[in-house]
């Protein structure tokens, strides 16, 4: 990974584009920390394992988060 000690936040750009929950391999929510003072959301896609930084403020992404958490709560006993 192209990382050095000087890199503070993971996302160079963020996307507002809606993501189909079915095409998601993984959704990571990285809370704000001493290294990066903002929340970062990283989606890993099933296709080629592409990772995409999502805009936490986007309505489409907020809806995605709701859909994913709903799906998780259905699965957990």
């Amino acid at each position: 990974v192209p990382l050095s000690r000087t890199v503070r936040c993971t996302c160079i750009s963020i996307s507002n584009q809606p993501v189909n929950p079915r095409s998601l391999e993984k959704l990571e929510i990285i809370p704000a920390s001493q290294f990066c003072p903002r929340v970062e959301i990283i989606a890993t896609m099933k296709k080629k394992g592409e990772k995409r930084c999502l805009n936490p403020e986007s309505k489409a992404i907020k809806n995605l988060l709701k859909a994913v958490s709903k799906e998780r709560s259905k699965r957990s006993p």
């Epitope: 050095s4 993971t10 750009s13």
Partner: antibody
Framework: QMQLVESGGGVVQPGRSLRLSCTAS????????MHWVRQAPGKGLEWVAV????????FYVDSVKGRFTISRDNSKNTLYLEMNSLRAEDTAIYYC?????????????????WGQGTTVTVSS | EIVLTQSPGTLSLSPGERATLSCRAS???????LAWYQQKPGQAPRLLIY???SRATGIPDRFSGSGSGTDFTLTISRLEPEDFAVYYC??????????FGPGTKVDLS
Amino acid sequence: QMQLVESGGGVVQPGRSLRLSCTASGFTFSNNGMHWVRQAPGKGLEWVAVIWFDGMNKFYVDSVKGRFTISRDNSKNTLYLEMNSLRAEDTAIYYCAREGDGSGIYYYYGMDVWGQGTTVTVSS
Amino acid sequence: EIVLTQSPGTLSLSPGERATLSCRASQSVSSSYLAWYQQKPGQAPRLLIYGASSRATGIPDRFSGSGSGTDFTLTISRLEPEDFAVYYCQQYGSSPIFTFGPGTKVDLS
């Protein structure tokens, strides 16, 4: 459509300063990292600097470190390159380029929108 | 620092022929971090391929990218008149920096 327009180039003497601007339209500028890339006459492309979408990180090629500063004003949809202590070898066409949507340190989507460039000539 | 080498320097071909352009890295590069660009005289570069093999928006399917590790390839299956240009590979590396190769010129034979 998505567009980037550079300005501020010109002829300048060695040791002097210049500020380039790049104005964006047709996309949400505040969502995208931005780059400056240059091309000396008859030569290939050389990456100069990058700034994260929110200005959180800035990085430079070694040859301009300490002389050039990349910055942005998201309220004005504008990217800047402040160039100090200019040298003859800085003579080039300077392009601004948009970092692809969703790029991060784990996956790179390339520079997907480019301006037409502004020419900087450093000569005495 | 990773150095990219492109070969050949110039490729002389005719429309309809297949073009195979090579990009070699001095150290292993993740395919997630490799891109290809096209530049025509007097124009800005244009993104063709990202992630070593994914076509950028609007790029015709005659352009394809492949490779991994230190060896990457851009293939143009059938050259169209508008494809005669200079092609650059580029990698995103540590620090982070974004390095371009020296370019391959595809010209009319």
